[in-house]
Amino acid sequence: EPPTACREKQYLINSQCCSLCQPGQKLVSDCTEFTETECLPCSESEFLDTWNRETRCHQHKYCDPNLGLQVQQKGTSETDTICTCEEGLHCTSESCESCVPHRSCLPGFGVKQIATGVSDTICEPCPVGFFSNVSSAFEKCRPWTSCETKDLVVQQAGTNKTDVVCGPQDRQR
């Protein structure tokens, strides 16, 4: 009696179970009563990453430099190419199909996490005691100057955008 289901890594065709093609190979001809499934390797620019009965391999992703992309990991017959972004840019999506410049943290905000090829800059507001007076994709919030350690006094209070201004202590006459 012909099978109605097949084992793992097999498929049902013409009332018989044929072996699937291994990753990196495509289906050319089904198995027969006498011979195994005919599979052929994907070409250099193609891949298949699962046991399959695909008659065409998938094209490797192209990391388009015009979109700011570069190759992070070259594809094989079993894996797709992985793209990342050039320095100063990050991916717009998980699939990394294009890149945009990293955002800078505005004055009053510092860099919590520096951007990578796949993630944007993460900014945080400078808490009390810290400031940032620049727009930067790298600089963290800096602590206010400690006037006391310099034998000076605060002449002007700091904000999240400005440092304190220190001055000499008033001398008693």
Epitope: V28, D30, T32, E38, T55
Partner: antibody
Framework: EVQLEESGGGLVQPGGSLRLSCAAS????????MSWVRQAPGKGLEWVGT?????????DYASWAKGRFTISKDTSKTTLYLQMNSLRAEDTATYFC?????????WGQGTLVTVSS | DIVMTQSPSSLSASVGDRVTITCQAS????????LAWYQQKPGQAPKLLIY???TLPSGVPSRFSGSGSGTDFTLTISSLQPEDFATYYC????????????FGQGTKVVIK
């Protein structure tokens, strides 16, 4: 029954054209590569070309066949074709259709093409 | 284009003899194993005898065996039978973009 049957052979004048057919039965025609192989009288086997499985039907030809011979298929009719143009005396041969690309698991009985004036 | 060179072109042998036919490819076949052997008798279509260099289709007698890899391959008939007198062809597959398959010129096995 799993089989291949060629037809369309015959006598043709040099410079003429001919279309051979190969009717397939007993297997899933759409998921199999199909090839043509020829054999001149008293000579060895010679690969002509292959059409691969899939809807796009990519083809591959022996260098001597490129431009003159065209392989196509009609999946709904489970039929393979070989269109031969600008035929020469040296194209005289029995033409076999076969299932497969890197090895041929099933062959037709062949159809004889004679190119002569 | 890949070229397959088969030797000898013909050989005389007796029933029970061990027969060896060699096939050399001008360049490596795909995956080093895309080499098939076919048997053809007069007036008949060829029949697949060995594929993937050494795999026998079910139904082919075990006296037939294939070996080799890359460019050098061998077909062996361990004990020649009356029905084995025929012509044998090797066929190598290079790729789907560079002249696919090429056959050897054939080896005719005749009765001594």
């Amino acid at each position: 029954e799993v089989q291949l049957e060629e037809s369309g052979g015959g006598l043709v004048q040099p410079g003429g054209s001919l279309r051979l057919s190969c009717a397939a039965s007993g297997f899933d025609f759409s998921s199999n590569a199909m090839s043509w192989v020829r054999q001149a009288p008293g000579k060895g086997l010679e690969w002509v070309g292959t059409i691969y499985a899939g809807s796009n039907g990519n083809t591959d030809y022996a260098s001597w066949a490129k431009g003159r011979f065209t392989i196509s298929k009609d999946t709904s009719k489970t039929t393979l074709y070989l269109q031969m143009n600008s035929l020469r005396a040296e194209d005289t041969a029995t033409y076999f259709c076969a299932r497969g690309a890197s090895y041929f698991t099933l062959w037709g009985q062949g159809t004889l093409v004679t190119v002569s004036s | 284009d890949i070229v397959m060179t088969q030797s000898p072109s013909s050989l005389s042998a007796s029933v029970g003899d061990r027969v060896t036919i060699t096939c050399q490819a001008s360049e490596s076949v795909v995956s080093n194993n895309r080499l098939a052997w076919y048997q053809q008798k007069p007036g008949q279509a060829p029949k697949l005898l060995i594929y993937l260099a050494s795999t026998l289709p079910s139904g082919v007698p075990s006296r037939f065996s294939g070996s080799g890899s890359g460019t050098d391959f061998t077909l062996t008939i361990s004990s020649l039978q009356p029905e084995d007198f025929a012509t044998y062809y090797c066929a190598g597959y290079k790729s789907s973009s560079t002249d696919g398959t090429a056959f050897g010129q054939g080896t005719k096995v005749v009765i001594k």
